[in-house]
Amino acid sequence: QAGPLPKPTLWAEPGSVISWGNSVTIWCQGTLEAREYRLDKEESPAPWDRQNPLEPKNKARFSIPSMTEDYAGRYRCYYRSPVGWSQPSDPLELVMTGAYSKPTLSALPSPLVTSGKSVTLLCQSRSPMDTFLLIKERAAHPLLHLRSEHGAQQHQAEFPMSPVTSVHGGTYRCFSSHGFSHYLLSHPSDPLELIVSGSLEDPRPSPTRSVSTAAGPEDQPLMPTGSVPHSGLRRHWE
């Protein structure tokens, strides 16, 4: 008897973080033997949607013409072949921004930082929230850090970084959210440009560089105690 069918691949275009009102397409890619594709949404009646495969039958398209709160959540897809249903795909977390008013992002003590020193990015919301997210534009992993204050409602979250280096430099934004729905985020804050001075760009280690020089180590992952997040929204609780 053959083993279980391989799980399909699930992804979203143009991405998994979508502003309110924008369109998004969810793709499920299985095998050429697929006869039908099914998309399930967590905490919704299954199936959330069914689609016939597009030629050459190895994938299906699920279209969301206008993003709203109802579409935000965690999805998995399956495909049916002549021998039965596949294993579920890895989950896709579809996040909607624009659910709440934008927070304010600032840098303490200053957005101009010397390499080898520290900076704290402060995300502040007008109304109390329990979850804050910091992103860095054009980062390999743009959704970097989410924290919850033990369920307590807070007006702000601090994101400490040390030691700062040239890699920390760039444009940051933050979002806020409520714990009851981590898939609904605020509008993004206005951008904050972090400028790191005194950095030496050197692709190889220098055995004689000491702390008295201007150079600093590269940036650390912004996840507090975890590894760099993968695609989609990776949460870390404190």
Epitope: T120, P160, M161, S162, L200, P203, P217, P224, S227
Partner: antibody
Amino acid sequence: EVQLVESGGGLVKPGGSLRLSCAASGFTFSDYGMHWVRQAPGKGLEWVSYIFSGSSTIYYADTVKGRFTISRDNAKNSLYLQMNSLRAEDTAVYYCARADGRGAMDYWGQGTLVTVSS
Amino acid sequence: DIQMTQSPSSLSASVGDRVTITCRASQDISKFLNWYQQKPGKAPKLLIYYTSRLHSGVPSRFSGSGSGTDFTFTISSLQPEDIATYFCQQGNTLPWTFGGGTKLEIK
């Protein structure tokens, strides 16, 4: 479970060399900066050196600058400290520690003792 | 370099006591102050980072406070397993520096 295991310590004469190793497991080593910290017998902690994940930039304490070299091999999940021109005052337990990106060292190895004596 | 002054250097307390250790930085380090516990013959363990955030798995009887140059570490109710030496460390500016340590003993 995060684990850091140092090795390579021992007795060496003044002016001699040693190479310490730190084997990491239980986390994605290439995602983290790493430190060496030392502790002389009965004394406090002294930060020695820091290397970030890609080895592109490095820091040393002034007390070891020019004598010690920190390096890493991400493919082997290993951190190293090459110690040359050793002095009696370098005698200490040497710990490797993982950087948390916020100014702290969140996990430490058990340490390896380096004794510099004639 | 930033100097870290920790006091007292030793402390004797009874089980159930509230224990407080202080750490002073020679210049402003914002909240980049960490506390470690070290038992004899063992490696240090991170207890508190960024002044007051508890590292994973650390009991809630440990806490920290402060900002700028003056910081406090507190054990709300001393337990026998808390007998150790405690170090503060600034992570604001390289080179990172440690306090001299506080050796905690049971009365």
